[in-house]
């Protein structure tokens, strides 16, 4: 959570300065048009002002920058590059600003940027080099430790002819720049699957939020290398069962808390291992709330209350006995 300041300590620019662009470096106490600034809190807020581009005259002291609720559309390369650079900028919130394109190097020249929130932008075009800044196979490490990408999926008719999951993952993995990332939020993005290599290349993750997606299975996902992972949010997906390999990997993580609420668990013979695990594990939070969705006869049964006799699979009839 980024620090903010009370409104009374903010200075506002006069509206008539809206189109002014300073050719000189900004004065230390200058505040961009349509923004509120607090030098004491090192915070600039340009919120719900329908801005179409990032203000050029941001004060050099800015540590927390809120550019939410605008109409930025495109974030070009070097969108925050300034002379002198915004060396203090640590937290940048661009949520809900109608961004549909983030270009390569959009966040270059921000040496202290630790938190970035791009949530609630329909990102049809997220460059693979948006966060790494270059197309080198190994880029300079990004200072980012927290990347919030909740609800960045564009409407279906605006998506490029490629996998949205693939586009996001390419940006996360480019140049191995995000090796220091500790928090990654990817909630509400209609993800159908998680590419198997993504987690292996983000070894510092402490918090991973994949809630409210459409994940059906974790069979090909490995959590083994995420030895620092503290919370894994998988609520509100389409998970049917967790298999032994996944259960063992989760159980072995030293700091983990797992959230599994509101998935359509299929309570048939394939669920037996997971039920056995749930009865003994302490890593699943609120495990007593997990219920079956299928088959119909099992709907709303609590997983923790099931025994092996409840978990059967209908026998597959030989073709000669099958009826049409």
């Amino acid at each position: 959570s980024s620090p903010t300041s009370s409104a009374s300590s903010f200075s506002s620019s006069a509206p008539f300065l809206a189109s002014a662009v300073s050719a000189q470096p900004p004065l230390p106490d200058q505040c961009p048009a349509l923004c509120e600034c607090s030098e004491a809190a090192r915070t600039v807020k340009c919120v719900n002002r329908n801005l179409t581009e990032v203000p050029t005259d941001l004060p050099a002291y800015v540590r927390n920058l809120f550019l939410t609720g605008n109409q930025l559309a495109v974030l070009p390369a070097g969108a925050f590059a300034r002379r002198p650079p915004l060396a203090e900028l640590a937290a940048l919130n661009l949520s809900g600003s109608r961004l549909d394109e983030v270009r390569a190097g959009a966040f270059e020249h921000l040496p202290s940027l630790r938190q970035l929130d791009l949530s609630h932008n329909p990102l049809a075009d997220l460059s693979p080099f948006a966060f790494s800044g270059s197309n080198a196979s190994v880029s300079a490490p990004s200072p980012l430790v927290e990347l919030i990408l909740n609800h960045i999926v564009p409407p279906e008719d605006e998506r490029q002819n490629r996998s949205f999951e693939g586009m996001v993952v390419a940006a996360l993995l480019a140049g191995r720049a995000l090796q220091g990332l500790r928090r990654l939020e990817l909630a509400s993005n209609h993800f159908l699957y998680l590419p198997r290599d993504v987690l292996a290349q983000l070894p510092s993750l402490r918090h991973l939020d994949l809630s409210n997606n459409s994940l059906v299975s974790l069979t090909y996902v490995s959590f083994r290398n995420l030895t620092h992972l503290e919370s894994l949010h998988l609520e509100d997906n389409a998970l049917k069962v967790l298999h032994n390999g996944t259960l063992a990997e989760l159980q072995g993580l030293p700091h983990i808390r797992v959230f599994l609420d509101n998935n359509p668990w299929v309570c048939d013979c394939h669920m037996a291992d997971m039920v056995t695990w749930l009865k003994e594990t302490e890593v699943v939070q609120g495990k007593d709330r997990l219920t079956c969705a299928y088959p119909e006869k099992m709907r709303n049964r609590v997983l923790l209350e099931l025994n092996s006799a409840d978990l059967d699979c209908d026998p597959i009839l030989p073709p000669s006995l099958q009826t049409s």
């Epitope: 032994n244 259960l247 700091h255 594990t281 302490e282 890593v283 939070q285």
Partner: antibody, heavy 122, light 111 residues
Framework: EVQLVESGGGLIQPGGSLRLSCAAS????????MSWVRQPPGKGLEWVGF??????????ENSASVKGRFTISRDNSKSTLYLQMNSLRAEDTAVYYC?????????????WGQGTLVTVSS | DIVLTQSPLSLPVTPGEPASISCRAS??????????LQWYLQKPGQSPQLLIY???NVESGVPDRFSGSGSGTDFTLKISRVEAEDIGVYFC?????????FGGGTKVEIK
């Protein structure tokens, strides 16, 4: 920096009651299971019980030797763990340690307090 | 309850020499591929400090001369080269099942 500081120990008569406190700091208290472990003078360690975290409803588990007599609770607004000890016996004499369970509680306790001595004697 | 038996009860050591302590469980402490067995050191007048968790993971800040091995029911704590500061009582603990239980302890002292 994680810190656990116990208090409330002392001399108490058999059959009496005592409440131990453990003030926690340096971590998000509600995320963690917390426990009490005791050590009679010159002896080994004995697990007393634990209380689960917010995600698991702050439910408790106790060892058989204290069940029905000792109650573990927590005040999350004060980041404090408690051990209410009733019907105390001579064999409850021990140093009582408060300890934090690791994020995955199956890996047991990673931080311990300095302990508080409870002596049950007439 | 799972009973943990430690041996030896007492271990006189020479600084610079290796040392080894055994812990045997009355039943397996493994659960989904991980053995939930910890080792603690209690130095004189201090509270216990975690050395090893999950049978073989060395806790952050613990010198790398300490190592743990084993699975199922048989576990070993090794000190590659004992130092004077390593004296104290070593306890193993299982957290596979409630109630969690501790071994009786091994007292390590300088010869």
């Amino acid at each position: 920096e994680v810190q656990l500081v116990e208090s409330g120990g002392g001399l108490i008569q058999p059959g009496g009651s005592l409440r131990l406190s453990c003030a926690a700091s340096g971590f998000t208290f509600t995320d963690y299971y917390m426990s009490w472990v005791r050590q009679p003078p010159g002896k080994g360690l004995e697990w007393v019980g634990f209380i689960r975290n917010k995600g698991n409803g702050y439910t408790t588990e106790n060892s058989a030797s204290v069940k029905g007599r000792f109650t573990i609770s927590r005040d999350n607004s004060k980041s404090t763990l408690y051990l209410q000890m009733n019907s105390l016996r001579a064999e409850d004499t021990a140093v009582y340690y408060c300890a934090r369970y690791r994020g995955n509680p199956h890996y047991a306790m990673d931080y311990w307090g300095q302990g508080t001595l409870v002596t049950v004697s007439s | 309850d799972i009973v943990l038996t430690q041996s030896p009860l007492s271990l006189p050591v020479t600084p610079g020499e290796p040392a080894s302590i055994s812990c045997r469980a009355s039943e397996s402490v493994e659960f989904y591929g991980t053995s939930f067995l910890q080792w603690y050191l209690q130095k004189p007048g201090q509270s216990p400090q975690l050395l090893i968790y999950g049978a073989s993971n060395v806790e952050s800040g613990v010198p790398d001369r300490f190592s743990g091995s084993g699975s199922g029911t048989d576990f070993t704590l090794k000190i590659s080269r004992v130092e004077a500061e390593d004296i104290g009582v070593y306890f193993c603990q299982q957290s596979r099942k409630v109630p969690s239980t501790f071994g009786g302890g091994t007292k390590v002292e300088i010869k």
